[in-house]
């Protein structure tokens, strides 16, 4: 069922030079070191599977230690075109160009890639995050200003012999990191061109990529401590479900979030947490080392399998969905924020999900693989899990079809 043995040559084995090439933490993103231009300018770049632009700070900003200086690069080419990217909160805008790009702790290649040079931004860069740009690893369909701007990974595969696959192991620390610790700590691995078997345990299970824009998948069932939420599975994917390393939380559609929180509250009812905790706003703290993980339930998401009527489930622990945070008043204690939140744009399987698993973005075969991460945080009683197969009928009905809004649908 896991289809591991049918991988083509070059897709298996060890990628020693790429292991441990990510740093960061779930709250502020994971970043990889990249170089741009000639001579090479080194920048830390956020790894984001939820967008498709390679964009870097290219002007001074209070939160940036360094930025891309196009005038110092002999290989920079101006595309004479602007780009503007608004978010729900914040935005960035810049100028498009191309330059030579490489990843020091990645494949030994240099490619000419599109770069958005960010000249202005609002609430985009994060103070103390230590990254200066973003690497959008999703598909051209969601690239800005339009799908004609080839994303970095497409350029990489087109210009080299690197297989069309990458995989991510994001390692949550399990405790808050101060500035020094965050810089010194290992954040995980981005394996470009294949799968590193040292980064996971057990089997890899694959779910189809429903459509190549975001990394869209289909959730067919949700359980809290083994109790089915019993919702129409379309609700779980309304209006889509995506795997997004650039988002911190597990984000759920409103109805699903409300049902999930109700169930998590019921399971952990020995304690009465303030409403602000369940809204993700308020910390809750325990005396150091006394966090009662056992009172919090596990969350299981069942994903459509590769075989008709077959699904598999991924299960995360409270160690993934309670995010360690610290402030000056609580430094002696263990404090957490609830990292499951409400979404109006569908399910987002962010870092809190990905930190439990080694996630394979097998673009060549239009599928995403999940296996238990060798670095996930757990306790002596429970561990994150990837299990299957399960029989699930009519899974195609779980996908939501977003109404088209282009001109063709407006014809009468």
């Amino acid at each position: 069922e896991t289809d591991e043995e049918s991988e083509e040559p070059g897709r298996r084995g060890s990628f020693v030079e790429m292991v441990d090439n990510l740093r960061g933490k779930s709250g502020q993103g994971y970043y990889v070191e990249m170089t741009v231009g000639s001579p090479p300018q080194t920048l830390n770049i956020l790894v984001d599977t939820g967008s498709s632009n390679f964009a870097v700070g290219a002007a001074p900003h209070p939160f940036l230690h360094r930025y891309y200086q196009r005038q110092l690069s002999s290989t920079y080419r101006d595309l004479r075109k602007g780009v503007y990217v608004p978010y729900t909160q914040g935005k960035w805008e810049g100028e498009l160009g191309t330059d030579l790009v490489s990843i020091p702790h990645g494949p030994n290649v240099t490619v000419r890639a599109n770069i958005a040079a960010i000249t202005e931004s609002d609430k985009f860069f994060i103070n103390g995050s230590n990254w200066e740009g973003i690497l959008g690893l999703a598909y051209a369909e969601i690239a800005r200003p339009d799908d004609s701007l080839e994303p970095f990974f497409d350029s990489l595969v087109k210009q080299t012999h690197i297989p069309n696959i990458f995989s991510l192991q994001l390692c949550g620390a399990g405790f808050p990191l101060n500035q020094t610790e965050a810089l010194a700590s290992v954040g995980g691995s981005m394996i470009i061109g294949g799968i590193d078997h040292s980064l996971y345990t057990g089997s890899l299970w694959y779910t189809p990529i429903r459509r190549e824009w975001y990394y869209e998948v289909i959730i067919v069932r949700v359980e809290i401590n083994g109790q089915d939420l019993k919702m129409d599975c379309k609700e779980y994917n309304y209006d889509k479900s995506i795997v997004d390393s650039g988002t911190t939380n597990l984000r759920l559609p409103k109805k699903v979030f409300e049902a999930a929180v109700k169930s998590i509250k019921a399971a952990s009812s020995t304690e009465k947490f303030p409403d602000g905790f369940w809204l993700g706003e308020q910390l809750v703290c325990w005396q150091a080392g006394t966090t009662p993980w056992n009172i919090f339930p596990v969350i299981s998401l069942y994903l459509m399998g590769e075989v008709t009527n077959q699904s598999f489930r991924i299960t995360i622990l409270p160690q993934q969905y309670l995010r360690p945070v610290e402030d000056v008043a609580t430094s002696q204690d263990d404090c957490y924020k609830f990292a499951v939140s409400q979404s109006s744009t569908g399910t987002v399987m962010g870092a809190v999900i990905m930190e439990g698993f080694y996630v394979v973005f097998d673009r060549a075969r239009k599928r995403i693989g999940f296996a238990v991460s060798a670095c996930h945080v757990h306790d002596e009683f429970r561990t994150a899990a990837v299990e299957g197969p399960f029989v699930t009928a009519d899974m195609e009905d779980c996908g939501y079809n977003i109404p088209q809004t282009d001109e063709s649908t407006l014809m009468t």
Epitope: F273, C285, T330
Partner: nanobody
Framework: QVQLQESGGGSVQAGGFLRLSCAAS????????MAWYRQAPGKERELVSS???????AYADSVKGRFTISQDNAKNTVYLQMNSLKPEDTAMYYC??????????????????WGEGTQVTVSS
């Protein structure tokens, strides 16, 4: 919704005094501790003084003998009496409370809340 209302900040000459107060409302849980922190421009936020629900107090070395913390449990209010103020006491002062959310409202589990801050300026 927990709300903290700070007051009493202002400008004063060195050697003068101020009394800060912080009133907490909007919750039914028990208060575990109340504290004052301060943050001067370009510096880290630091503990000034705290008082626990059993009445025990703690002070930063730099304010011992000059500042006194007290609480009015009936009003859920904490006070900071600041005497013999020095220019180095200039900072934004923040109220912090810990609310017990453990079994029966015990403090084995708590939720920390911050006020918006009140400015204290001491000129020489």
């Amino acid at each position: 919704q927990v709300q903290l209302q700070e007051s009493g900040g202002g400008s004063v000459q060195a050697g003068g005094f101020l009394r800060l107060s912080c009133a907490a409302s909007g919750y039914t849980y028990s208060t575990c501790s109340m504290a004052w922190y301060r943050q001067a421009p370009g510096k880290e936020r630091e503990l000034v003084s705290s008082i626990r629900n059993d009445g025990s107090t703690a002070y930063a070395d730099s304010v011992k003998g000059r500042f006194t913390i007290s609480q009015d449990n009936a009003k859920n209010t904490v006070y900071l009496q600041m005497n013999s103020l020095k220019p180095e006491d200039t900072a934004m002062y923040y109220c912090n409370i810990r609310i017990g959310v453990g079994p029966g409202g015990t403090c084995s589990i708590y939720a920390p809340y911050w006020g918006e801050g009140t400015q204290v300026t001491v000129s020489s």
